[in-house]
């Protein structure tokens, strides 16, 4: 694969003239501080840019905001600061965009020293704004009801929960002493409350409440709550134990009406639980190790969220910074990448292709050599830089990138050796969802996926010099064209493209400095004149996902089915287009024992696919046995893996056993069983809105 423009990349030559005619520069003539961008709606071309400049003077901060609006994907911007009455907008709350294509926008004003606050709201994609006075000061960004964008929820700095049903015009206070609130499905709101001093003081003694009618009636659904979180169709709560300072996870699939204890280890005060990923089938749960180790264990749940299988040991998740590299590869189902902390304290990347069933190292790219971290120069792996590396201020401009509509493509910074290296990383690409990798670009880059994978763009990270070049590829990163988008380099801060990777436009943001001031500047490049032809049937080829051995008639079978996709040929230079829909054809596979997990009280011996009964129950298994619900203790030893669609083949049906007989213990009293089995549970969940960017569902 070439990283330079050469003979093999001759198709990309002469692009300059075509791109120059569709490169648009915009200079923001204001004091530069920070800039926030938000796309309003899907395919509307509307972008809002909020620039903020803040100066701390003694005890207060004075600042200035400017609001700009584009209707052409960032090619031109209009200064619309007058629409918000030149008010200073709180940049920490960002621009709150409504769900779906509602066209709704909320900006929260900074009204220093007042008992109330002000918001600016728009229902027409930011074309006009009206201001509304708030009877409270928001503690965090106002949240929309996912199913009705007129209904808003807010938590105040005095821990009051407020609701508006008319898009911010009128507000009613729902509850006092609220720590955390989250939207459930429909009109359901879950929230935790404290009784005595504060959220922090009452941690572990909070109550979990639910309203299903927007605050007309309330129900306590949990007590002794430490934290709560939502993931897929599961409601989780960590609940303090009666006997000590430990807590454990309880789960509900009926919005908190009934709870079951999860078969997971309990954790102490210094530990935490975190939902790494969840869907309607299952959940990935991280359980922190005791002590300040910086790692824990990943468990994967059954379809009830109750029984858990150990998935990965020594999973890196720092207690202090709350950083984990756990990444859902959205371009191929079942694929996740994360990091483990090995015994020698080096960090290694692991990948699973079957939703946490098995983890392996990433295959070494064929066009790369093993680095200094490798003991054997012929055998090593690719290690991916993600959130942890970024938090450690390594030269990693971007986290791994994948998009659901760019099937199989994963782009990431990495190094090739026995562990992650602190040396300057290169950029690697996989076109098959992480099975194989190739070095794509030398050195750190910012990158973006455009046109559903038909176009990749990248800009070299250059902290000390200005940037005036963008690289682009139409063949999934094999060949790169280079385009000089400006004569005068800019101090580059980032690439911006419309979420969803369907656009043909990309914006490069940065600033220019003169002796007296610096100002924001953006360049928007439209690649439509370079790639003019619309893709046709002949441009696509059939690709089997998860293919590892074409001679096996179970090839590609993951979670009981295989999928064939129509994918753009690398050699085709054409536009997928905004309306492109991924074409995939699933086929059911025959069942094998691999399609089943071991139910509670059973385990798989090393190198065996059969589930064997545990001779005795210890630790958290025993606790689950004592306090778990009756019906969860009757099993034939196997459960179909959540989301597995296999049919026929092996059916491991055997005698159903009641494991209740095994529930004996000196230190846990069985009489507590009944009060616990259906007892209420819950949790407060959320020191973790900082995890939004990382897609961590919930972290205590």
């Amino acid at each position: 694969r070439s990283t330079e423009q050469g003979e093999s990349c001759s198709g990309l030559l002469g692009a300059d003239a075509k791109l120059a005619g569709n490169t648009h520069q915009h200079i923001f003539n204001d004091l530069s501080g920070s800039v926030s961008l938000a796309w309003v709606g899907d395919g509307t071309g509307v972008i809002l840019a909020l620039t903020t400049f803040q100066v701390p003077i003694f005890m207060i901060t004075i600042g200035q905001s400017k609001l700009y609006r584009s209707e052409d994907y960032g090619k031109s911007f209009e200064d619309v600061t007058n629409l918000i009455n030149n008010t200073f907008i709180r940049s920490d709350f960002g621009i709150a965009i409504g769900p779906e294509n509602s066209g709704k926008v909320i900006l929260t004003a900074d009204v220093s020293g007042s008992h109330g606050s002000r918001i600016f709201v728009s229902s027409d994609f930011g074309k006009s704004f009206t201001h509304q006075e708030l009877p409270f000061v928001p503690l965090m960004q106002i949240t929309y009801n996912p199913e009705n964008s007129n209904v808003l929820l807010a938590l105040s700095n005095k821990n009051e929960l407020w609701l508006s049903e008319d898009f911010g015009t009128n507000w009613k206070k729902l509850y006092d002493a609220v720590c955390l609130a989250k939207w459930g499905s429909d009109n359901t709101i879950f929230f935790t409350t404290y009784a005595n001093g504060s959220c922090k003081a009452d941690l572990g003694a909070l109550e979990l409440w639910r309203t299903s009618d927007l605050g007309k009636s309330f129900k306590t659904i949990g007590v002794k709550i430490y934290s709560f979180g939502l993931g897929g169709r599961f409601l989780f709560a960590s609940v303090m134990a009666d006997k000590d300072t430990t807590r454990r996870i309880h789960v509900s699939t009926d919005q908190g009406d009934t709870w079951s204890m999860a078969q997971l280890p309990s954790v102490g005060q210094e530990q935490f639980y975190s939902i790494l990923a969840a869907n309607d089938d299952m959940v990935f749960m991280h359980v922190d190790e005791p002590g300040d180790t910086g790692f824990g264990t990943i468990f994967t749940s059954d379809d009830r969220g109750i029984v858990y299988s150990k998935s990965l040991d020594r999973h890196l998740y720092t207690t202090t910074g709350g950083e984990t590299d756990f990444t859902n590869v959205t371009s191929l189902r079942g694929v996740y990448i994360t990091s483990v902390l090995s015994e020698d304290n080096s960090i290694q990347t692991m990948i699973t292709f079957d939703q946490g069933g098995r983890w392996t190292h990433l295959r070494k790219p064929e066009n790369s050599e093993c680095d200094a971290t490798a003991k054997n120069k012929n055998e090593c792996s690719l290690h991916i830089h993600a959130s942890y590396s970024i938090s450690q201020k390594l030269n990693v401009p971007m986290a791994p990138l994948s998009e659901p509509n760019a099937v199989g493509i994963v782009i990431a910074h990495g190094s090739v050796g026995d562990a992650i290296s602190v040396m300057v990383p290169d950029v690697y690409i996989s076109d098959d969802g992480g099975y194989s990798w190739t070095k794509m670009l030398e050195g750190p880059h910012h990158y973006a996926i455009l046109d559903s994978g038909g176009l990749l763009v990248a800009v070299e990270q250059n902290a000390h010099q200005g940037v005036n070049q963008i690289k682009f590829s139409t063949d999934e990163g094999q060949c790169w064209g280079v385009y000089n988008f400006t004569k005068d380099p800019i101090f580059f801060t980032g690439l911006a493209s419309e979420p969803g990777a369907r656009s043909m436009n990309v914006s490069l943001w940065g600033y220019r400095s003169s002796l007296f001031h610096q100002y924001w500047i953006s360049f928007t490049i439209d690649f439509r004149d370079l790639i003019t032809r619309n893709c046709e049937e002949k441009d696509y080829t059939i690709w089997l996902a998860h293919s590892t051995d074409p001679e096996d008639y179970e090839d590609g079978c993951i979670l009981g089915y295989k999928e064939q996709f129509l994918r753009l040929r690398k050699s085709s230079v054409c536009q997928n287009g905004r309306d492109y829909v991924v074409t995939k054809q699933p086929s059911i596979c025959l069942c094998s024992l691999e399609d089943f997990l071991c139910d509670f009280g059973y385990y798989r011996p090393e190198n065996d696919s059969k589930c064997v009964e545990q001779p005795e129950l210890k630790g958290h298994d025993l606790e689950f046995c004592l306090y778990g619900r009756e019906e969860h203790l009757t099993t034939n030893g196997y459960r179909k893996i959540p989301g597995d669609k296999c049919q026929g083949g092996v059916n491991p049906v055997r005698e159903v056993k009641d494991l209740k007989k095994k529930c004996t213990s000196n230190f846990l009293s069985p009489e507590k069983q009944n009060s616990k089995s259906n007892g209420s549970a819950g949790g407060s969940g959320g020191l973790n809105d900082i995890f939004e960017a990382q897609k961590i569902e919930w972290h205590e």
Epitope: E537, I542, L544, S547, P550, E551, D552, Y553, D555, G556, K562, E563, Q564, Q585, P586, S587, I588, C589, L590
Partner: antibody
């Protein structure tokens, strides 16, 4: 020229045995999965058995399982089908077919076939 | 077992006419369906693989379409040499199966 040539067919009594061979030429035999497909007189095609390039995967139709054995010798560019406990319903033309190299690929090259008749 | 149902069983067609043969699978087989032509006293020959990909050397009048459970083989302008039996075949799941065949005769 890519070619597959079957041999070993003939008349055999019920309960008897027969070994079919298929000689391959014109391609790298050791890189392809190979198959046996049969066709009873005046009837359609029926898949019989499949063997992967290195013999790691071997598959049979239920109708022949336990009676037929597929094997190959990559050094000799040859595919075999050992047929035991033959029945009247095994009477057919037996074709040797190469499977393409893709996942779930088609049978892209076929031999001319060899006739097996099971009759008392 | 995946059952492939081909229709029609028999078709008598005038030269230059368009012929359409359908093949329906009892469950989804993705694109793993192939079409073969078998002339009298000859072995089968591959025409179309993966539902729509023409095999090398096959005349352009033969085309295939479909995915999932419904597939079609089209002969755009029938020629005399196209008189043969046509079979669909699925390779998605074991046991591998064939359709019952469609015999095309020239009027």
């Amino acid at each position: 020229e890519v070619q597959l040539v079957e041999s070993g067919g003939g008349l055999v009594k019920p309960g008897g045995s027969l070994r079919l061979s298929c000689a391959a030429s014109g391609f790298t035999f050791s890189s392809y999965s190979m198959n046996w497909v049969r066709q009873a007189p005046g009837k359609g095609l029926e898949w019989v058995s499949s063997i992967s390039s290195s013999s790691s995967y071997i598959y049979y139709a239920d109708s022949v399982k336990g009676r037929f054995t597929i094997s190959r010798d990559n050094a000799k560019n040859s595919l075999y089908l050992q047929m035991n406990s033959l029945r009247a319903e095994d009477t057919a033309v037996y074709y040797c077919a190469r499977r393409g190299s893709g996942s779930y690929d088609a049978f892209d090259i076929w031999g001319q076939g060899t006739m097996v008749t099971v009759s008392s | 077992e995946i059952v492939l149902t081909q229709s029609p069983d028999f078709q008598s067609v005038t030269p230059k006419e368009k012929v359409t043969i359908t093949c329906r699978a009892s469950q989804s087989i993705g694109y793993s369906l192939h079409w073969y032509q078998q002339k009298p006293d000859q072995s089968p020959k591959l025409l179309i693989k993966y539902a729509s990909q023409s095999f090398s050397g096959v005349p352009s009048r033969f085309s295939g379409s479909g995915s999932g459970t419904d597939f079609t083989l089209t002969i755009n302008s029938l020629e005399a040499e196209d008189a043969a039996a046509y079979y669909c075949h699925q390779s998605s799941s074991l046991p591998l199966t064939f359709g019952g065949g469609t015999k095309v005769e020239i009027k």
